[in-house]
Interface confidence: medium
């Protein structure tokens, strides 16, 4: 048995409500992107900004599919492409193994009801490995930088939260019971958990780079929309079979 | 629901033109290939014509190249078939069909998953 | 005459299980292009019944399974009931014709 993609009809759960009839959801993609030869990379696209349904995502590069993932059908990947694409994580791809004739560029095509089609483009630029390398040098100091800032920032956040929580909490003890349930159910499908084979019913990790372009409140909508997908996607959503 | 509702088949002469309509509801038209399929009476299925999504791409039956012209206009949420120069060998009923995806290369992987209810064309003096 | 070839006819008896064949070549169904099987019951339209080679929609029932292997595909039917006598078509598309094909059809009867 094979389960919906809960994440495709989640995508719009968290959007407000906004004029129908005209096209206002935007693609955020991991835009320019470079990997090493024979490394693997996840392609990821998001969708927001829009109430519509999503019904299906493809994959394609220049003019070749790659991968579909359809809300009652489920993942398909391209038989040319299966040895070295995996679905996910969430609507985006795994490539692997990658070679240099994999630089160029990739699409994700979001199919919606009623807006229709929108497309992310991002450019992938294989790297021969010692040049890939080269460019690591220069990347690592950053990202331990960014990573530092982060884990300082996070602390400080979490020590605020803490207290403050720690306060509320000598005063509502129900509440806390309550919260303490709704965490117990987010566990059972947080963005790390497995879905079930072949599904594409996982949570969508925020693609790379998403967070520092974005305002903070919307990162914190991202955040908040994978808490609700987290336990709501404990509901029935089996609408697929498949044969083997 | 997804639904599709073909109209304009009816009794036309040989040599005459007849335009079918196939008007789309419940789904992102704009989203999807679509094909016309016939079936003539006691025969089986016959492909004749698909468009890509967007229109850019159409594609015929041989037996139909030439004479038949598939059109969309998304705007509408309709597909039409354009029928010209019409024989005998025409009569059946027509199909419209979706096909499981869009997108913008992949139409001929994915078969069609809907089908309207039909309309029927006949083509005799 | 049609580019996939099927039986004309088959027919089973209530909980048997009937196979129906369907052979093409090298630029359809030996391709990598998928074979999709619709059911075309009496007097309606066709319905899709099996995509992607091998797999169901939803709502359609576990006794219906499919397969391919080289340039031939064949739908099996297995405790076969008397609903499900109809006919059967395997449909690809065919990169020599740039066309979509389908099989002549095949009437399942149900005795």
């Known amino acids: 048995m094979r389960w919906c993609l809960l994440l495709i009809w989640a995508q719009g759960l968290r959007q407000a409500p906004l004029a129908s009839g005209m096209m206002t959801g935007t693609i955020e993609t991991t835009g320019n992107i470079s990997a090493e030869k024979g490394g693997s990379i996840i392609l990821q696209c998001h969708l927001s900004s829009t109430t519509a349904q999503v019904t299906q995502v493809n994959w394609e590069q220049q003019d070749q599919l790659l991968a579909i993932c359809n809300a009652d059908l489920g993942w398909h990947i391209s038989p040319s492409f299966k040895d070295r694409v995996a679905p996910g994580p969430g609507l985006g791809l795994t490539l692997q193994s990658l070679t240099v004739n994999d630089t160029g560029e990739y699409f994700c095509i979001y199919h919606t009801y009623p807006d229709g089609t929108y497309t992310g483009r991002i450019f992938l630029e294989v790297l021969e490995s010692s040049v890939a390398e080269h460019g690591a040098r220069f990347q690592i100091p950053l990202l331990g930088a960014m990573a530092a800032t982060l884990v300082v920032i996070c602390t400080a956040v979490i020590v605020v939260v803490a207290l403050t929580r720690k306060k509320k909490a000598l005063r509502i003890h129900s509440v806390e019971g309550d919260l303490r349930r709704k965490s117990a159910g987010q566990e059972e499908w947080s963005p790390s958990a497995p879905s079930p084979p072949g599904s594409c019913v996982q949570a969508e990790a925020a693609p790379a780079g998403l967070c520092g372009e974005q305002r903070g409140e919307d990162c914190a909508e991202l955040h908040d929309y994978f808490n609700v997908l987290s336990y709501r996607s404990l509901g029935n959503c089996s609408f697929f079979t498949e044969t083997g | 629901e997804v639904q599709l509702l073909e109209s304009g088949g009816g009794l036309v002469q040989p040599g005459g033109s007849l335009r079918l309509s196939c008007a789309a509801s419940g789904f992102t038209f704009t989203s999807y290939a679509m094909s016309w399929v016939r079936q003539a009476p006691g025969k089986g299925l016959e492909w004749v014509a698909g468009i890509s999504y967007i229109g850019r791409n159409e594609y015929y039956a041989d037996s139909v190249k030439g004479r038949l012209t598939i059109s969309r206009d998304n705007s509408k949420n309709t597909l039409y078939l354009q029928m010209n120069n019409l024989r005998a060998e025409d009569t059946a009923i027509y199909y419209c069909?979706?096909?499981?995806?869009?997108?913008?290369?992949?139409?001929?992987?994915?078969?069609?998953?809907?089908w309207g209810q039909g309309t029927t064309v006949t083509v005799s003096s | 005459q049609s580019v996939l070839t099927q039986p004309p006819s088959a027919s089973g008896t209530p909980g048997q299980r009937v196979t129906i064949s369907c052979s093409g070549s090298t630029s359809n169904i030996g391709t990598s292009r998928y074979v999709h099987w619709y059911q075309q019951l009496p007097g309606t339209a066709p319905k899709l019944l099996i995509y992607?080679?091998?797999q169901r929609p939803s709502g359609v029932p576990d006794r219906f399974s499919a397969s391919k292997s080289g340039t031939s595909a064949s739908l099996a039917i297995s405790g076969l009931q008397s609903e499900d006598e109809a006919d059967y078509y395997c449909a690809t598309w065919d990169d020599s014709l740039s066309a979509w094909v389908f099989g002549g059809g095949t009437k399942l009867t149900v005795l």
């Open positions: 069909a979706k096909h499981l995806t869009g997108g913008t290369t992949d139409y001929y992987y994915y078969g069609m998953d809907v």
């Open positions: 992607f080679d091998s």
